[in-house]
């Protein structure tokens, strides 16, 4: 008799794929543009990335450092009208893209939370949550919560409002902190909170260090749902050299939890390549004309257009990983087991019941390495086969679909492999 199938866990929409942050509408859309109507025209692009949610804004009225002139219920006219927002929501829903609204109050000012008027601001946030939930948004984000006094209790209250409206609504909090204890204390009192932080931001050094950070985090958070990113708002290129971007995309899409990206992460958008552009929100490179300020700065391979035409590009890799992440049970909600693979490497298995299983091997180093996969670290339910099929490599040149002998696995510098193998009873 066939073994009984394991009961599927309850899956919320944010469990099924990546979130995509557009913190600066104008930078995302490019010169002279930058409103909600224009963003509506970019939803097909977001669909092509297979992302599940769009984290938008802040877009509310905020006069720098002025509480009285900050209105969380009003859209800044530079971005459009409430009607434009409603229209964006409707279009996004048709494309199965959820919209999360950033309500960080003083986003143009020095202290995001007007430190001297916390209670006034907290009341404004509460009113805004109720208003925008009625308007049809799917969730909220608040950033820089390390600057919010009594953050845990406020977050708990805002979470109650959000979940009270519907279990299908999400609250994301962002912090600049990379300290695990601070992160855990924020999570403790807020069961379903999705928290983005700088926890992984210094993980680029070695495979061992990254493995240790990831496993510590997962062990400390138990069975709660995580999110994975390198910061609450910034681009991957702020933290990583170009040669590690593919590796991190593969890792973020295959760890258990919700991967969260900023606009431009999918093409390796890098403010350093665009002199004069702000590090935190450089202009999105749709094509070579997107950055007219400096002739010659942008080559085709840095743009959406150029990378869309190249199957070996970072954007093509992002699309493939996003697709896999949203349809494979083992990646959607499978168990995670990290195990030793030798110095410089980070490897883990994702598996769910009798579904196809995935092996991820990441070489963070700048030398080629042979992987010594220590299957003895794994529980019986997650044993390794002798061979696994190569689904994709972050580097060109490997024959995809070909079976690889796991005992003789060699990785190029900065290479990541995603391999698949069937369940064996």
């Amino acid at each position: 008799r066939a073994p009984r199938c394991r009961e599927l866990p309850a899956q919320k929409w944010w469990h099924t794929g990546a979130l995509y942050r557009i913190g600066d509408l104008q930078a995302f859309q490019g010169h002279g543009a930058g409103n909600l109507a224009g963003l509506k025209g970019r939803l097909d692009y977001l669909s092509s990335l297979k992302v599940k949610g769009l984290v938008l804004g802040p877009i509310h009225k905020n006069q720098k450092d002025d509480v009285a002139q900050t209105d969380l219920l009003q859209i800044d006219p530079n971005f459009g009208s409430k009607e434009d927002f409603d229209s964006l929501l409707q279009s996004a829903k048709k494309k199965s893209i959820r919209v999360i609204l950033d309500l960080t109050p003083n986003y143009r000012g020095e202290n995001s939370w007007f430190s001297t008027q916390v209670d006034t601001v907290a009341t404004k946030v509460k009113d805004a949550l109720e208003f925008w939930l009625q308007a049809g948004v799917d969730g909220f984000q608040v950033r820089d919560i390390e600057n919010l006094k009594d953050a845990s209790s406020f977050l708990a209250e805002w979470q109650n409002i959000t979940k009270g409206f519907s279990e299908d609504r999400l609250l994301i909090a962002g912090t600049n902190s990379s300290d695990l204890q601070q992160i855990l204390s924020l999570l403790e009192s807020n069961k379903d909170l999705l928290l983005t932080s700088s926890y992984l931001s210094d993980s680029g050094s070695t495979g061992e260090h990254t493995k240790s950070l990831v496993t510590q985090y997962l062990n400390a958070t138990g069975n709660r749902w995580c999110s994975w990113s390198l910061s609450q708002a910034r681009l991957l290129t702020s933290f990583l050299p170009a040669q590690l971007l593919r590796l991190y995309q593969l890792m973020l899409f295959t760890l258990p939890g919700t991967p969260v990206f900023s606009y431009g992460d999918e093409i390796g958008l890098d403010a350093a390549a665009l002199p004069g552009q702000p590090m935190e929100a450089p202009v999105m490179l749709w094509d070579e004309s997107s950055f007219p300020d400096i002739p010659g700065a942008v080559s085709a391979n840095m743009t959406v257009k150029g990378q869309s035409e190249d199957p070996g590009s970072l954007l093509s890799l992002f699309r493939r990983l996003s697709d896999q992440r949203s349809k494979e049970r083992s990646l959607l909600h499978g168990d995670f087991h990290a195990f030793s693979a030798g110095p410089g490497l980070f490897s883990y298995i994702r598996h769910w019941d009798q579904n196809e299983r995935f092996l991820v091997v990441l070489n963070f180093g700048d030398v080629g390495l042979s992987a010594g996969l220590q299957a003895s670290d794994l529980p019986a339910s997650a044993s390794l086969p002798a061979k696994a099929d190569l689904l994709l490599s972050t580097q060109p040149g490997r024959e995809e679909g070909s079976p690889l002998e796991l005992e003789r696995l060699k990785l190029e510098p900065h290479e990541g492999l995603l391999l698949r193998f069937p369940y064996a009873a």
Partner: antibody, heavy 119, light 113 residues
Framework: EVQLVESGGGLVQPGRSLRLSCTTS????????MSWVRQAPGKGLEWLGF??????????EYSASVKGRFTISRDNSKSILYLQMNSLKTEDTAVYYC??????????WGQGTLVTVSS | DIVMTQSPDSLAVSLGERATINCKSS????????????LAWYQQKPGQSPKLLIY???TRESGVPDRFSGSGSGTDFTLTISSLQAEDVAVYYC?????????FGGGTKVEIK
Amino acid sequence: EVQLVESGGGLVQPGRSLRLSCTTSGFTFIDYYMSWVRQAPGKGLEWLGFIRNKANRYTTEYSASVKGRFTISRDNSKSILYLQMNSLKTEDTAVYYCTRDRPAWFVYWGQGTLVTVSS
Amino acid sequence: DIVMTQSPDSLAVSLGERATINCKSSQSLLYSSNQKNYLAWYQQKPGQSPKLLIYWASTRESGVPDRFSGSGSGTDFTLTISSLQAEDVAVYYCQQYYSYPYTFGGGTKVEIK
């Protein structure tokens, strides 16, 4: 013809403030990044910061050496660039140039205005 | 900050001879995606404002005589004046625009021997 004319320099005591102006003509002011660069007597050039163009919402970047003390602003209706200098130190003594940017290299320069900080 | 180091500090060259100025950056100015070096060269004649000569390490600004050329990649760059003219007496500066703050070299003074 592009013209940049700095003014407002002079002798000022340490700790005091001064505002430099750069009056521009010959181009569409709002379309360009504008920078300030200084040169201490007999020394090299030092970039102080810039203010972006309209398309980039007139946001600013500063060198760490002046951040928090100096503020770059612009009056787009008059095509004038400003450098507000507070808490001046003797080491701020220099010729101050305004430039029109590319925005990473400096194509057009004013003639400069000398600021002397001394008690 | 990226430190730009120029050598020599000063240079005396006969009219019609070649003048070579070096500039070294503390980190690479080559951006891999577009294969561009984020470096510019300026000329400052006595009592005048600086004038842009070259950007992207080797692209001459319009109106600059072709005796001026820039070369190099990564961390090592050179400005060459192929045949020195009397009007080329000046201080020459390199400048990086790879990252904030934009920084200049200390300058190289070119004189007639």
